[in-house]
């Protein structure tokens, strides 16, 4: 058993049918010695008397808010949560496996640049009685500071019969140098509590591997005289690291017809302009990627050909 | 893919060109190592990230773009080092920091070159003959060093008398390639920045 926060305790339960459970001793936080009784949640059934209460925690029915009283007055509370292990594996029931980039991916993180700021998000089908708390650090043995905000509900989606909820959190490395070469990964730890169930999820990454630039901005077309060709120009996104000559991007320019089946023409360039043939009803899209370290491409920025 | 390059300052061009070749070569070698050594811990998640140049060179600090010198976090470990004359830049442009930066890059390349050559000698003794270093990568390191044209004592190749542990050598190769790729990215950024300024 360990303390999650004041008066909230997590009991680690290795569960299997007929498991003996964990013996837990609760102590009433009071100088009083006599006439103390214990109850669980809203029940008035007295579970025991005395300054300490010994319970055998075998299942969620044994978890909840234990309260010690004296003469009708509440002395203290202890909320017991369960962290369940089955077949040697800690439960991961609260969050959905996003399966990207690999199975058992519960947390996904992205950074728009090398400033040390990143966003992580996760999915759940649970809508109520749910709390998250997020901690992060650079490295784990001698951790350096990363400050995370509060997790917030960032999107709701309907998937068939199901509603899916997306939560996200923003974190910032306390002293980040954009040019630094990372040797220790960022560690992100999310504590999830649903009803009386505690679970924790972790992710470990280098900022360089989670870079996804914003799409190029100010995408413009300039028709070339007496030609079907157009000059496409764009700019680096505002959120990208500076100076741009050091943090350079490479770009992919795509001409796409109205139908998804039509052949796409693609050009790669390091410049912020390109000359392409504009077909009727087609659109031109440009996306960006770090020129030297191939992490994710940005989303597309698009303009119609007409 | 071939990266189109803007017409560079003729003084800087060889280094920019060679640094792009270097990044391409080390990335290809790393990809080959990950495929060939698929049953070894060779991915970024599995290896320990070691930097053989740590405390010996200060490339990131010495090559910091001017715009980032205002960032306190980038100046933590900034230290001065010896100055030598490099030929990548026309001499009128060679400032104290630039010379320091380029000499630091040269020292990095020299250190990695020695490590890779020592390692290759061991890998050639492996009866499995599973993986060797790409000669192209070694050649590209050499070309960039020549373009940088710094005078420096040659470091003798490390020789060891004991029987090599091929498993450990292959793990070390992965660690080295990952670190060298990260340094090659920094070198490429630096050359691009110097070329633009």
């Amino acid at each position: 058993i360990w303390e999650l926060k004041k008066d909230v305790y997590v009991v680690e339960l290795d569960w299997y049918p007929d498991a003996p459970g964990e013996m837990v001793v609760l102590t009433c936080d009071t100088p009083e010695e006599d006439g103390i009784t214990w109850t669980l949640d809203q029940s008035s059934e007295v579970l025991g008397s005395g300054k300490t209460l010994t319970i055998q925690v075998k299942e969620f029915g044994d978890a909840g808010q234990y309260t010690c009283h004296k003469g009708g007055e509440v002395l203290s509370h202890s909320l017991l949560l369960l962290h369940k292990k089955e077949d040697g594996i800690w439960s991961t029931d609260i969050l959905k496996d996003q399966k990207e980039p690999k199975n058992k991916t519960f947390l996904r993180c992205e950074a728009k640049n090398y400033s040390g700021r990143f966003t992580c998000w996760w999915l759940t089908t649970i809508s109520t009685d749910l709390t998250f708390s997020v901690k992060s650090s650079r490295g784990s043995s001698d951790p350096q500071g990363v400050t995370c905000g509060a997790a917030t509900l960032s999107a709701e989606r309907v998937r068939g019969d199901n509603k899916e909820y997306e939560y996200s959190v923003e974190c910032q490395e306390d002293s980040a140098c954009p040019a630094a070469e990372e040797s220790l990964p960022i560690e992100v730890m999310v504590d999830a509590v649903h009803k009386l169930k505690y679970e924790n999820y972790t992710s470990s990454f280098f900022i360089r591997d989670i870079i996804k630039p914003d799409p190029p901005k100010n995408l413009q077309l300039k028709p070339l005289k007496n030609s079907r060709q157009v000059e496409v120009s764009w700019e680096y996104p505002d959120t990208w690291s500076t100076p741009h000559s050091y943090f350079s991007l490479t770009f992919c320019v795509q001409v796409q017809g109205k139908s998804k089946r039509e052949k796409k023409d693609r050009v790669f360039t390091d410049k912020t302009s390109a000359t392409v043939i504009c077909r009727k009803n087609a659109s031109i899209s440009v996306r960006a990627q770090d020129r030297y370290y191939s992490s994710s491409w940005s989303e597309w920025a698009s303009v119609p050909c007409s | 893919r071939n990266l189109p390059v803007a017409t560079p300052d003729p003084g800087m061009f060889p280094c920019l060109h060679h640094s792009q070749n270097l990044l391409r070569a080390v990335s290809n070698m790393l990809q080959k190592a990950r495929q060939t050594l698929e049953f070894y811990p060779c991915t970024s998640e599995e290896i320990d990230h070691e930097d053989i140049t740590k405390d010996k060179t200060s490339t990131v600090e010495a090559c910091l773009p001017l715009e980032l010198t205002k960032n306190e976090s980038c100046l933590n470990s900034r230290e001065t080092s010896f100055i030598t004359n490099g030929s990548c830049l026309a001499s009128r442009k060679t400032s104290f920091m630039m010379a320091l930066c380029l000499s630091s890059i040269y020292e990095d390349l020299k250190m990695y070159q020695v490590e890779f050559k020592t390692m290759n000698a061991k890998l050639l003794m492996d009866p499995k003959r599973q993986i060797f270093l790409d000669q192209n990568m070694l050649a590209v390191i050499d070309e960039l060093m020549q373009a940088l044209n710094f005078n420096s004592e040659t470091v003798p190749q490390k020789s060891s008398l004991e029987e090599p542990d091929f498993y450990k050598t292959k793990i070390k190769l992965c660690i080295l390639l990952h670190a060298f790729r990260i340094r090659a990215v920094t070198i490429d950024r630096v050359m691009s920045y110097l070329n633009a300024s």
């Epitope: 969620f60 089955e86 029931d93 649970i126 649903h194 009803k195 | -």
Partner: nanobody, 123 residues
Framework: EVQLVESGGGVVQAGESLRLSCAAS????????MGWFRQAPGTEREFVAS????????FYADSVKGRFTISRDNTKNTVYLQMSSLKPEDTAVYLC????????????????WGQGTQVTVSS
């Protein structure tokens, strides 16, 4: 929201068997831990058995262990309770429940309930 409908109850002789079914509709069935409870007239709701969302773990009340088997078919959105060696004291309304906590024998840990199906065991 999840809707639960029980079926399969009836009158049987002591020692006989019965299979109860609980069909779920609405939200994704495989997100829920499922349980069976029973309630005889004038008594509190009593836990019978529960099964985790994947169907890989089960949990039983001591009074039914070895006689009752809970199972589920996530493709059919159905949970079953196979009852054998029935006794007169098994007579009750059997209720199907869906929740998020497994294992739990406490009724208020379950969020959704069916209307129940009557099982009568005569001696």
């Amino acid at each position: 929201e999840v809707q639960l409908v029980e079926s399969g109850g009836g009158v049987v002789q002591a020692g006989e068997s019965l299979r109860l079914s609980c069909a779920a509709s609405g939200r994704s069935f495989s997100d829920y831990e499922m349980g069976w409870f029973r309630q005889a007239p004038g008594t509190e709701r009593e836990f019978v058995a529960s099964i985790n969302r994947r169907g890989s773990s089960t949990f039983y009340a001591d009074s039914v262990k070895g006689r009752f088997t809970i199972s589920r078919d996530n493709t059919k959105n159905t949970v079953y309770l196979q009852m054998s060696s029935l006794k007169p004291e098994d007579t009750a309304v059997y209720l199907c429940a869906a929740g998020w906590l497994f294992p739990s024998s406490r009724s208020r840990d379950y969020d959704y309930w069916g209307q129940g199906t009557q099982v009568t065991v005569s001696s």
